[in-house]
């Protein structure tokens, strides 16, 4: 590229006309401030191209950089672009006007910058000052560019004298921006909404002053744009939040909402997504199974838990035998429903030191204006077994009988066992089971009765022993799902002059003997 006259700096007179020519081996063009200028282009016989720029009626505002470049200058080397700087000294123009981008100088690190105050006359003496300050700052000045150096976060002005007139430039604001790597968080006021309700999402980025938010959302794909609002988070400088608000959601607004945040200074970016579901109407759905029969142990505390999903938040009521339950003042019942996630709830009924009377039919009902669900179960109060009576008798028939009576819920199993060697029982010799087998000379008769009011079973079992020829330790063990109890009696032969009975509780025996039940239930009564 060849420029005529070559420059690199020209000083031209106000109101004059001046012609600049640029030529090259391909089409060339004159540009100023990235804009093509009105010019005459030509192609010579020898395949050289030229462009003639005619500057007419020059004023100080024509001062500045002019470039000649190849027409398609993308990817060209720097030497394929020629720069020329023209001064047009003009006493009516003080400092060349700046646009807003030049007046506010943002930086992200301590680096040399240029305060671009430029004059039309290279002979003028220009000084730099803090705005409203008189002292000139010792910073080098280039008439084509301005003052270059490292500056503090302040406002600055340039001064010059044209004739006898002191002229000030606009103020320049130097400001360091807070920039760091980007970490985005996205959340929604709610991720499930009914149609007609609002969707509000927030995208937050911390530690950056220069961020661009871009939202991607289902409505955008159909060309319906929503204008986000950017603001600051409470008490946090550089906690910047973009809010996307979609009023009156439609079913089509369901989907993925993505917030993409970019920071142009260091080219950092991050994005996060969140799913929003728009439902036609509200819902309540049970999660998991709760068995139709539930158990609680007498005098222990029991918590019954129901998990469900709902939107909008439902009202939850508990009933027992169709009567509404509430937190009792005595603290026997506690009800609580807590939100474990946005739409998931856990409702709990806690019975403190369970009583027999608390058995019954329980229902939990969760409902709102759009839907309801209910769950029912029967609560059975389990009562550990107790042996209430163990007695031995010998009717005239010659056989000897032992009667064992006990209660519990659920229905107790009864196990009879005996031990012949009293000295070694029960530590060394395992007891033998008694029942209706032929080798045992014993018979067993068991009756079961259910007592409605006490809500428990009573078991009465009678053991008939045919031949007792030496002292025998007979044990009655009652067992159910929540415990066991036992008693022992010593049965002596008819021929012995005395009968010695000893009742032994389960605690005395250390609960060591674990025996499998053999039941012979002859009668099973309910009263």
């Amino acid at each position: 590229l060849v420029i005529t006259p070559p420059g690199p700096e020209l000083i031209l007179n106000v109101s004059s006309t001046f012609v600049l020519t640029c030529s090259g081996s391909a089409p060339v063009v004159w540009e100023r401030m990235s804009q093509e200028l009105p010019q005459e282009m030509a192609k010579a016989q020898d395949n050289t191209f030229s462009s003639v720029l005619t500057l007419t009626n020059l004023t100080g505002l024509d001062t500045g950089e002019y470039f000649c470049t190849y027409n398609d200058s993308r990817g060209l080397e720097p030497d394929e672009r020629k720069r020329l700087y023209i001064f047009v000294p003009d006493p009516t123009v003080g400092f060349l006007p700046n646009d807003a981008e030049e007046l506010f100088i943002f930086l992200t690190e301590i680096t040399e910058i240029t305060i671009p105050c430029r004059v039309t006359d290279p002979q003028l003496v220009v000084t730099l000052h803090e705005k409203k300050g008189d002292i000139a700052l010792p910073v080098p000045y280039d008439h084509q560019r301005g003052f270059s150096g490292i500056f503090e976060d302040r406002s600055y002005i340039c001064k010059t004298t044209i004739g006898d007139r002191e002229v000030d430039s606009d103020a320049y604001y130097v400001y360091r921006l807070q920039v760091s790597s980007i970490n985005v968080s996205v959340n929604a006021v709610q991720t499930v909404v009914r149609q007609g309700e609002n969707i509000t999402l927030m995208c937050i980025v911390i530690g950056n002053e220069v961020v661009n938010f871009e939202w991607m959302y289902p409505r955008k794909e159909s060309g319906r744009l929503v204008e986000p609002v950017t603001d600051f988070l409470l008490d946090m400088p550089y906690h910047i939040r973009s809010i996307l608000h979609i009023p009156s959601a439609e079913l089509e607004d369901s989907g993925t909402y993505t917030c993409n945040v970019t920071e142009s200074v260091n080219d950092h970016q991050d994005e996060k997504a969140i799913n929003i579901t728009v439902v036609e109407s509200g819902y309540v759905r049970l999660l998991g199974e709760v068995g139709a029969l539930q158990f609680a142990e007498l005098h222990r505390s029991r918590t019954l838990q129901v998990v469900f999903e709902a939107y909008p938040p439902p009202t939850v009521l508990w009933f027992k035998d169709n009567r509404t339950l509430g937190d009792s003042s005595a603290g026997e019942i506690a009800l609580s429903t807590r939100n474990v996630s946005e739409t998931r709830y856990v409702s709990e009924l806690t019975l403190v030191r369970v009583k027999v009377a608390e058995a019954g039919h329980y229902t939990m009902r969760a409902f709102h204006e759009d839907a309801e669900v209910q769950l029912s179960f029967q609560l059975q109060i389990n009562v550990p077994v107790r042996v209430l009576e163990l007695s031995e008798s010998h009717p005239d028939s010659g056989e000897q009988t032992v009667r064992c009576r006990g209660r519990g819920m659920p229905q107790p199993n009864i196990i009879w066992s005996a031990c012949r060697d009293l000295k070694r029982c029960p530590r060394e010799l395992p007891p033998m089971l008694l029942g209706n087998s032929s080798e045992e000379e014993s018979q067993l008769e068991t009756n079961v009765t259910y007592w409605e009011e006490e809500q428990e079973f009573e078991v009465v079992s009678t053991l008939r022993l045919q031949h007792v020829d030496r002292p025998l330790s007979v044990r009655c063990t009652l067992r159910n799902a929540v415990g066991q109890d036992m008693q022992e009696v010593i049965v002596v032969p008819h021929s012995l002059p005395f009968k010695e009975q000893k009742l032994i509780s389960e605690e005395d025996l250390g609960g060591e003997q674990k025996l499998i039940s053999e039941e012979d239930l002859h009668h099973h009564h309910h009263h």
């Epitope: 002053e209 603001d231 550089y238």
Partner: antibody
Framework: QVQLVESGGSLVQPGGSLRLACTAS????????MSWVRQAPGKGLEWVAN????????YYVDSVKGRFSISRDNAKKSLYLQMNSLRVEDTAVYFC????????????????????WGQGTTVTVSS | DIQLTQSPSTLSASVGDRVTITCRAS??????LAWYQQKPGKAPNLLIY???TLESGVPSRFSGSGSGTEFTLTISSLQPDDFATYYC?????????FGQGTKVEIK
């Protein structure tokens, strides 16, 4: 040297209209946002409206929305406030001010205050 | 809209006193807060911008601090020229709001 001069204030009846002007000198007017601020007698300052360099963005205090209109002519270095449907409560001294709003850095504006003010022009709305 | 509340409304002080004026915003404004001084019959004068940056030409006895919702203007040693009314002003989302003002008068 850097100066703003307001004009156009007068006495006007409720429901009437008025156009205020503010002329700038000593700075590149076209590079700055500009604002109107008013002060009722014996009261505090109230921001009224502002306008971006190329008039693409204009904002108003709620109490004047739909009644007042801010505009500018960069060639004439002038700012205007067209006031219609005037009310008694619009009585005030109206100041124009240079608003230091840099170009957007990302998705929001920075702000450096109102650094140059005019001397004010008085608007009285009374029957 | 964001409200600014200044306290106190009036402050009586003597020359040489340290004076503090508080400005509270109804929601976060980061540090986009400016302070102005106004004397009777005059236009306001910018003292501080961006909560704590002193405007050029403003005496160093003036200082500002705070961010989010709580801001203060402090005059370290009150001078005769400082008796005036002081206003805070916020900028957020393109609108502006001024506080109701604090009048600093001679005790």
């Amino acid at each position: 040297q850097v100066q703003l001069v307001e004009s156009g204030g007068s006495l006007v009846q409720p429901g009437g209209s008025l156009r205020l002007a503010c002329t700038a000198s000593g700075f590149t007017f076209s590079s700055y946002w500009m604002s109107w601020v008013r002060q009722a007698p014996g009261k505090g300052l109230e921001w009224v409206a502002n306008i971006q360099q190329d008039e693409n963005e204009k904002y108003y205090v709620d109490s004047v929305k739909g009644r007042f209109s801010i505009s500018r002519d960069n060639a004439k270095k002038s700012l205007y406030l067209q006031m219609n449907s005037l009310r008694v409560e619009d009585t005030a001294v109206y100041f124009c001010a240079r608003d230091l709003v840099p170009p957007r850095q990302g998705d929001y504006y920075h702000y450096f205050g109102m650094d140059v003010w005019g001397q004010g022009t008085t608007v009285t709305v009374s029957s | 809209d964001i409200q600014l509340t200044q306290s106190p409304s009036t402050l009586s002080a003597s020359v040489g006193d340290r004076v503090t004026i508080t400005c509270r915003a109804s929601q976060s404004i980061s540090d986009w807060l400016a302070w102005y001084q106004q004397k009777p019959g005059k236009a306001p004068n910018l003292l501080i911008y961006k909560a704590s940056t002193l405007e050029s030409g403003v005496p160093s006895r003036f200082s500002g601090s705070g961010s989010g919702t709580e801001f203060t203007l402090t005059i370290s040693s009150l001078q005769p020229d400082d008796f005036a009314t002081y206003y805070c002003q916020q900028y957020n989302s393109y609108s502006r709001t001024f506080g109701q003002g604090t009048k600093v008068e001679i005790k």
